[in-house]
Every structure is written in C-alpha cells, then in structure tokens.
C-alpha cells in the first residue's frame, strides 16, 4: 500500500477555501522529490492541477498554492474560491503522477445553506464588525433604507433610516448613508454572535421599485491553535484582537462545561486561585495585544482556552476572542523538582532550578512573583554577578550541580520571603520553573554569632555549630560576594556543645582570619553540602574596625549583636514583565530533552508525600 | 468538562451493519476533530476514522482497513458523531471509543492511536462472529 496519507474525502461549500494536507514518509528523498496534486479523469489518467516545482495549471491560477515542509514530512494544498465544478476525485502523490506514490481525496463542493443568485457571502470572525454594502438606483436615494433577517420563513426588520434598531442588535448596529456620490447604503454590526449568522435582505424603498441585495453572513467560531507544552514547563498565550479593543478590559479563561469559560487572569485584577504563583499577563500594547504566561505546567492545566476583550473582563456573547488547545505532555524533558520548599526563619533554603542542559552557557536568572495587579516577576539575582541591593549577602546563585539544574541559596530567613519564585533562563523560554518557599516554625540548625566585629591587624576565629544530622556532610566557610561564595579553609573543632540531645557527632567548624585587613569585611556563610549538591547555610556579617586593645578575638554564640536593617529596595530594580518576557534575545525559543541527576537526600533535606512535591530546607 | 457517550455496539454476523454513536457534551467553542478509534484484546489501540471541522468545510480520514466500509459522520445540531460500519468482518470485533478535541485529525496524530486526545467515552463493544 502507498505510505501517502491524507483526507479520504473533503467537504466544503461553493466560495470557501479548502487546506489539504497530504502526509509521506519524511526520508531524504521523499523530501526533496515533486509533490504534486491532480484530478483524476473519466479514463484513469491524473492531471497535475499544481505541482512544487512550480506548475500552477490555468483553472488553479490566482487560487492555489502548495507549500512543502520537508521537517514534518507534510505538504498542504491550498484551494481558494471553490465551485461546485472543482467536486471530483483527486490525487496527491509524490514524484511522478503515474507512480504509486499517492493518495486519493474526494473533493466535493455543495452549492452551501440555500442562497440565492446574487448573495453576496460575509464570513467573518464571532466577536468581529462587518460591514454589508447595499447598492441602490437614484430613484430610491431618498427613500426608506431598511435590512431584514430572513428568520424561518419571515424576514423581520433589523434596522431601518428612520432610527428603528431591533432589540437584538441594540448598541452594536448602525446603519450609514454614503455621501450623495455613492449610491450605496451600509449596515455595520459589531459584537458578531453566533446567533447573527444567516440571511439578510437590504432594501432600499418600500414598493415594487424597490432595489433588494441578499446577503449570507456566516460567524465563524475561532480554530483553535494547538499548543503541545511539556508537564512542568511553561506556555504563552499571545492574544492580538486588534486596536479596536485597545482600551477594552482583556481576559484569558479555560473552558469548562458547556459554554462555560472560568477566567484564569484578567486586566481587572482577577486570577484564578489555581494559577497563583505561575502566571503572568504581560501588559498590553498600543494595539490592545497582550500575552499570558504559565509556568510549572499541571495536566490539569490541558484544556481549552480563550482569550478576549470585554468591560466586564470575562467572556460576553459578542467578545472578540481567540482560542487555543493545549495539550500537556507527560512525558516531559523537564525533569521533577520540588515546587514547595520550607525554611524556619533566620534559616535557609538551597532551591534547585531545572533549566535544558543543552544551553549551559545561558544566563540563569531568579526572580520574585508578586500577584498584584496582573503579576510581574522582578529579578533578584542572576548568573552574571547582579545581585539586587537588600539581597546583598544572603542570595547567592550557583551553577551547580551544571548539567540541567543551578542552584539557589537565600539565608537569613523571615516571614517575608514566603512567596512565589521563577527559575528561568535567557535560554528555552519553556523551562521556566515555579517554587513556592515556605516559612514554617522551628529553629535553624546551623548556630552562629550575629554580627561580629574584627580588629585590623588581628586575628578572628567565628564558629559554626553543626548538628549532628549534618555529620555525614562536608561542612564550609565562604565569604560572600555577588558572583558566589568563595571558600575559605576552616577548622573542625571537634563535637560542639550548643545542641542538647546531640551526640559526639555534633561538630564546632571555626573559620579563622588572620591578620584582618579592610578587605575582610563582608558576609560569611557557613553551609553543608553533599558533592556539588547544597543544603542549609548561616550567614555572619563581620565589620572590622581600628585596634582598641591588643589580642585575637574569639567570638562566641553569647556575644552575637543583632542582625543589621535589611537594606532598602534599590531604584534601579529589574524585572522579568513587560518586554522583558518577550524579548527574543532574552528567551530564544528552542526545544530540548534534559535529564538531571537525582539529589543525594540530604541535600534536599525532606521530600513531602502528597498533592506537591516539597523540599525542606530547616529541621521541622 | 467534556463527556462523551458512545451506544450502539452489539453482536452481528460477518456481512452485517452496525451504526456507532457518541454524543458530547460540554464546552462546544471550535471543536476541531473527533474521532473513532477501537482497542481488541491484547492488542494496542488503532485509528478508526476521523472527522475534522475547519468553518464550512468537513476532511475525513480513514485507517486502510475500513476503507470503503465504514463511514464516519458528524451532526452538529444534536452535538453526535456516528460510525456507520458495513460489511463487518470477523477482524472487527474489538472496543469501540469515541475521542474528541484532537489536536488535528490527520497523520501523526491519527497514526499515534489518539495518544494526544484529551477526551475520551467509556467504549461500546462490537463483535462479529463468522
């Protein structure tokens, strides 16, 4: 059998448009040989209507067209202005017509919903404005002007010049006289509902003078595009429903029973509890288009979605609207990492970022999702050394482990940084992934002073107290600086006495700085980690001041001074919204498989059974 | 959500007829292709037919092993597809299930026995006894 497959048979109506697509086998050959389309003969033989070498035959000429794509291992033929003359058998084939490359189509073209000679065919988009043209002879030029809808076997009035308007068409229909040149009158209806499709008479005059125009108005409802999205990973929806709705409140919702359409996120300020934390609706242009984003793909999140225009910011009848299938694929390349991870306050979290390994060399980045207004996503921290102003000193990012995932560390934890956050890259737009941080009761595990001060010239020794959980850890110091955490030698100070109920494998580890300069004031961290893998991390600031007395300094838990103000919001703050997020260059679109290797289990601490996969970054 | 109803399954002889329905309900904005697809035992679930919508204009597909005996056919008003199965063979017998809101009836997705359909009815059985 022929390995060409397509329609078996294709129904359309006189004046419509037809896209056939014909699927082959998608081998080096296959792809580069003609691709042709013919109709088949009373006598069995096949004339070529249109071929991709460039034949167009004379009935298909200013009508047709064949586009091959080789990648798909498809092409599509297009016909335009069908007639009932073009219902026949076809074939479309690859190579040689005579060949057996090739497929049979039924093409069969009906004279369409009963209209009568001269009607003139509207076909537009539900939600859009048409306009119906009206033609009349001088004789009628001050006569009444009137449109009917033939509704069963009567045509009731419409509109009319003498101002009457059918409640139907209330506040969406107006009727235009062209200047006395013009001998044509128009009718335009906004807000097309499905319901307006059918047949309509204009009239100019009242007698049997009177000249009629029929007219057939089919309202289309939107193709929905298909959208394919990986389990995990994110999707957007761009909406462009034209400058007309500019300053109209826009929406974007999921269809769930009936006609039913749940709003997932409008410029209103309403969003679906189910998208919080993972969607924003980027705001509009001049010319009323917008964009919708979702990260941490659900399959639950499959389904129907439409976007439009309305005052009341949901779908209306009459709402200009464009629609999308999503699909969600389960077997996704975006590999599992937790989406809840929990902190106590004044600990940590080390939060893992999936992003496609194959773009290890992207710019990884880190930002906060804020719910109000339509959501925005201001940037906190990326791979390139920024680091926003009151982040300073507890939010770093790593780009270990490499291979497909980075790594987020934020200390010094407080109520306030419970919320939302995006991984993303200026890679695969795709791979933008959603955590949620947690902030539940319970002491950090690492114990370390408050602020400590050295002395120029002398020497600082800081502990860090280390339960025994962590004995199986590699325990660290590093100063902080806005491009990582430097490591620094420490010593282990044998079992610690800071944890009641902790045996000998409790640990003090000490880091020790000699002969302190200007250069050593800044932030410390001491952490643990398993391989390149990070868990929790403590942060001192150390400030360092002129000799008052001679001596080395040990610093003790007891001596510990508060913690400094947090630092205020800098002004020149950045953010992933706006253009940012549809900026090519800063999310160019590529496709990739990645796999990540999985954490060694302390390193993520605990992994939740339940509804959301949750990393804890704090004893409990 | 979308539900889907399938009837008119049953026992026939080899040669005879037997017309399939599914009816849907649920969100009807664009519903771009249904389909028939039907799973015997230990085998992997195969194409039937599918029937595209794309505005005024219907593309049906068929799987080579029906061709010519099976017709499938939509009507919009009462929201049903239909699977009018002629001529059926032994080899018929199997599951029947209705699919809808595919993402484009034809090759690939036609080919990968409805992997990407997100709604499906419950089957009606079909055997054909020689």
């Known amino acids: 059998k022929s390995p060409i497959f397509g329609p078996e048979e294709v129904n359309s109506v006189e004046g419509n448009s037809v896209s056939i697509t014909c699927y082959y086998p998608p081998t080096s050959v296959n792809r580069h040989t003609r691709k042709y389309w013919c109709r088949q003969g009373a006598r069995g033989g096949c004339i070529t209507l249109i071929s991709s070498e460039g034949y167009v035959s004379s009935k298909y000429a200013g009508r047709a067209n064949l586009t091959n794509f080789p990648e798909n291992g498809t092409f599509v033929v297009n016909i335009a202005q069908l007639s009932q003359d073009d219902s026949g058998r076809y074939k479309c084939g690859l190579g040689i017509n005579s060949r057996g490359l090739s497929f049979d189509v039924s093409l069969e073209v009906s004279q369409g919903p009963g209209l009568l000679n001269d009607t003139k065919v509207y076909t537009v988009d539900l939600g859009r404005t048409v306009t119906i043209n009206c033609p009349f002879k001088t004789e009628n030029a001050q006569k009444r002007k009137s449109l009917y809808k033939q509704i069963g076997l009567y045509p009731v009035l419409v509109i009319d010049s003498s101002g009457y308007v059918n409640p139907n068409y209330t506040g969406r229909i107006r009727l235009d006289i062209q200047g006395t040149g013009q001998l044509l009158f128009s009718v335009v209806i906004n807000q097309l509902r499905l319901s307006d499709a059918g047949q309509y008479l204009c009239q100019a005059g009242d007698d049997s003078n009177s000249n009629k125009k029929n007219a057939d108005l089919q309202v289309l409802k939107p193709e929905p595009e298909l959208v394919y999205e990986d389990l995990r990973g994110s999707v957007t929806f761009h909406c462009a429903l034209g400058p007309e709705v500019a300053n109209v409140a826009k929406f974007l919702c999921r269809q769930s029973s009936g006609e039913n359409c749940d709003v997932v996120v409008n410029t209103l300020g309403k969003r679906a509890p189910a998208f919080e934390g993972r969607i924003l609706l980027n705001p509009q242009d001049k010319d009323g288009s917008f964009s919708v984003v979702i990260t941490g793909l659900r399959k639950e999140d499959a389904g129907r979605y439409l976007c439009g225009a309305h005052s009341d910011g949901q779908l209306q009848e009459g709402s200009p609207i464009q629609a999308w299938q999503l699909f969600v694929n389960e077997e996704s390349t975006i590999p599992r990492s937790p989406t809840v991870v929990k902190g106590v306050a004044g600990g940590s979290v080390a939060v893992l970022c999936p992003y496609n390994r194959k773009e290890s060399k992207s710019i990884k980045y880190w930002c906060l999702w804020e719910g109000a207004q339509n959501g925005r996503c201001p940037l906190l921290v990326d791979s390139e050394g920024w680091v926003k102003a009151q982040y300073e000193g507890r939010l770093s990012l790593l780009e270990e482990p490499g291979n497909g995932t980075f790594t987020v560390i934020l200390n010094q934890l407080t109520s306030r940084d419970a919320g939302f956050y995006w991984c993303l890259t200026n890679g695969d737009t795709l791979w933008r992934t959603t955590v949620e941080i947690k902030i539940i009761e319970g002491e950090p595990n690492l114990k370390v002073p408050g602020n400590v001060t050295a002395v120029l010239g002398e020497t600082l020794k800081v502990p860090c107290h280390f339960p025994c959980k962590f004995s199986s850890y590699e325990k660290y110091w590093c100063k902080w600086n806005n491009t990582g955490c430097q490591a620094l030698p420490s010593q282990d100070e044998g079992p610690s006495k800071a944890f009641v109920n902790c045996d000998e494998n409790s640990r003090l580890v000490s880091l020790t700085l000699n002969l302190v300069t200007r250069a050593d004031e800044g932030w410390y961290w001491c952490g643990v980690k398993q391989g390149h893998f990070y868990g929790e991390t403590a942060a001192v600031y150390v400030a360092v001041e002129e000799r008052k007395a001679a001596g080395s300094r040990d610093v003790s838990l007891a001596k510990a001074d508060a913690a400094p103000d947090e630092k205020v919001l800098d002004s020149g703050f950045r953010e992933i919204e706006n253009k940012a997020i549809q900026d090519p260059r800063l999310f160019a679109e590529e496709k990739a498989v990645a796999d990540t290797r999985d954490q060694a289990d302390g390193s993520r601490a605990s992994v939740d059974s339940g509804s959301s996969e949750e990393q804890g970054g704090s004893s409990r | 959500e979308v539900k889907l109803v399938e009837s008119g399954g049953g026992s026939v002889q080899a040669g005879g007829s037997l017309r399939l329905s599914c009816t849907a309900s649920g969100p009807t904005y664009g519903r771009t292709c249904m389909g028939w697809f039907r799973q015997a035992p230990g085998r992997e679930r195969e194409g039937v037919a599918t029937?595209?919508?794309?505005?005024?204009?219907?593309?049906?597909y068929y799987a080579d092993s029906v061709k010519g005996r099976f017709t499938i056919s939509q009507d919009d008003a009462k929201n049903t597809l239909y699977l009018q199965m002629n001529s059926l063979k032994p080899e018929d017998t199997a599951m029947y299930y209705c699919?809808?809101?595919?993402?484009?009836?034809?090759?690939?997705?036609?080919?990968?026995?409805?992997?990407?359909?997100?709604?499906w009815g419950q089957g009606t059985q079909v055997t054909v006894s020689s």
């Open positions: 029937i595209e919508t794309k505005g005024l204009t219907r593309y049906t």
């Open positions: 699919a809808a809101d595919g993402p484009g009836c034809s090759g690939g997705a036609f080919i990968a026995r409805g992997r990407w359909y997100p709604h």
